[in-house]
């Protein structure tokens, strides 16, 4: 190896200057008594190298690139060798930004997987390898005093979410949770969340069903639908409120919302609808009056309202 490049910093802020030095050892100067060292960034030759012979006979060229505007590039020093460039050494330069503060950190407690799933927005592209770590600790109070640390949660590459398993959680106790972002140019931390996992529980929705007509029950009136729902069993003991939404299957009507309904209503007669019309219905629930997150909307149930009763003047007796 005849040459060696050293740089002021291989990773810099995008747009910052960078200084590099290329030294050619004395035993290589047979190539040319006064070799002219050339610089190249990517495919482009870079003027402005200052060259000198050092006391030990080595040749040194120093160049300052005033603005590194490439997020990744190879800087090489070379000599003219006949009609071609002889590369002596090259280094990879990276430029980017320190990580922005991760924002919009939020968490959901999933009772099915028994884990607390937290997600965040990482902020603008840094152009550098940036690692994210979900950090947390247990706290008996309002997270001002830190209890036991919980094992760091490291998301898979490129993901902005991480799951803390049940064995690291304490239900009905607060946890301090934040995201730390780190790359070669710096570290940033999101604001800390302080939460009890049960206060961010996201339930599964009930399953909507058609109400089985019972012999003694009156059939639904025109423009009415009778429906029932089966609560999600694992959330059965959690007090909830629910809401229905419905819209005609045909046409461009938007959803109409009905609620709040107590989970325990279990059955409901929905009226004020168009007669002889097919409707799509969905239900969702939330832990209430304690804090929680709305469930997703349930799978749709499709029901048709009965036709308007005939207006003939026959003497029908309705029992």
């Amino acid at each position: 190896e005849c040459g060696h490049i050293s740089v002021s910093a291989p990773i810099v802020h995008l747009g910052d200057p960078i200084t590099a030095s290329c030294i050619i050892k004395q035993n290589c100067s047979h190539l040319d008594p006064e070799p002219q060292i050339l610089w190249r960034l990517g495919a482009e030759l870079q003027p402005g190298g200052r060259q000198q012979r050092l006391s030990d006979g080595t040749q040194e060229s120093i160049i300052t690139l005033p603005h590194l505007n490439h997020t990744q590039a190879f800087l090489s020093c070379a000599l003219n060798w006949g009609n071609s460039l002889q590369i002596l050494d090259q280094v990879e330069l990276r430029a980017g930004y320190p990580p922005a503060i991760p924002h919009n950190l939020s968490c959901l407690m999933n009772l099915t997987t028994s884990s607390l799933i937290c997600q965040w927005e990482p902020g603008p592209e840094t152009h550098l390898p940036t690692s994210f770590t979900l950090k947390s600790f247990k706290s008996r109070g309002n997270c001002q005093t830190q209890g036991d640390s919980i094992l760091d949660c490291v998301p898979k590459d490129g993901q902005s979410h991480c799951s803390i398993p049940r064995k690291h959680l304490l239900l009905y106790q607060n946890m301090g949770i934040w995201v730390q972002a780190e790359n070669a140019l710096g570290t940033s931390m999101s604001p800390q969340l302080c939460l009890d996992p049960m206060d961010v529980v996201k339930l599964e929705p009930p399953m909507l069903r058609t109400m089985d007509p019972s012999p003694e029950a009156a059939p639904p009136q025109a423009g009415c639908l009778q429906l029932s729902w089966e609560p999600w069993q694992p959330g059965l003991h959690i007090n909830q409120k629910c809401e229905l939404r419905h819209k005609p299957q045909r046409g461009e009507a938007s959803w109409a919302l009905v609620g709040p309904l107590p989970l325990e209503a279990l059955q409901y007669e929905l009226c004020g609808l168009l007669p002889a019309t097919a409707y799509t219905l969905q239900i969702r629930c939330i832990r209430w009056p304690l804090p929680g997150h709305w469930s997703d909307w349930s799978p749709s149930l499709e029901l048709r309202t009965t036709e308007r009763a005939p207006t003939h003047h026959h003497h029908h007796h309705h029992h």
Epitope: L111, T112, T113, S114, R166, K167, L171, M198, P231, Q233, P234, L236, H237, I238, N239, P262, E264, A265, L266, P289
Partner: antibody
């Protein structure tokens, strides 16, 4: 402090009826599911029935379905178990319990003994 | 119905011993598994809920683990007041079944 106090146990003949009560204090009764668990002499625990916070959902063990009725009066902070058509195998200590959100029996009364014998 | 099988049904141990009791569900119950302690003539007492959460006031020598079908209650260092019968219970769905119990006796 949560307190659950059962009453109404005693000796009853087979086929007879009994009504157990459980007076609750120290918590907001109307926000919690409640339940009854029994324990026959020298045996393990057996869940009997539970009731949702407003009384709309009332599951029962197969062994008591159709004979026992669970109910609650949130204005009186009281849980009830109406037991009809009692059998010798219903002999047990009956415990009233407060349920947590994950179905756990968080707090228990001291129990009341029901003896079904001729 | 989900059946709960506890083992052993009884065990003899000395003060200071590490004791492990297992509970198996006949089908997966996620983490909906609770452990109770009962002393003669007394009402049961909740120790662990949702498989691994220690109920308030319960000493930290008690711990729970497992998920799905296999669960464990561990007493890290048995104390004189821990000699009792222990029950597991599933609370995923009704009927809420208890295990048959494990009696921990003095060796």
């Amino acid at each position: 402090e949560v307190q659950l106090l059962e009453s109404g146990g005693g000796l009853v003949q087979p086929g007879g009826s009994l009504r157990l009560s459980c007076a609750a204090s120290g918590f907001t009764f109307s926000l919690y599911w409640m339940g009854w668990v029994r324990q026959a002499p020298g045996k393990g625990l057996e869940w009997v029935s539970s009731i949702s916070s407003s009384g709309g959902v009332t599951p029962y063990a197969d062994s008591v379905k159709g004979r026992f009725t669970i109910s609650r009066d949130n204005s009186k902070n009281t849980l009830y178990l109406q037991m009809n058509s009692l059998r010798a195998e219903d002999t047990a200590v009956y415990y009233c319990a407060k349920l947590g959100e994950l179905g756990q029996f968080m707090d228990w009364g001291q129990g009341t003994l029901v003896t079904v014998s001729s | 119905d989900i059946q709960m099988t506890q083992s052993p049904s009884s065990l003899s141990a000395s003060v200071g011993d590490r004791v492990t009791i297992t509970c198996r569900a006949s089908q997966g119950i996620s983490s909906y598994l609770n452990w109770y302690q009962q002393k003669p003539g007394k009402a049961p007492k909740l120790l662990i809920y949702y498989a691994s959460n220690l109920q308030n006031g319960v000493p930290s020598r008690f711990s729970g683990s497992g998920s799905g079908t296999d669960f464990t209650l561990t007493i890290s260092s048995l104390q004189p007041e821990d000699f009792a019968t222990y029950y597991c219970q599933q609370s995923l769905e009704y009927p809420q079944m208890f295990g048959g119990g494990t009696k921990v006796e003095i060796k």
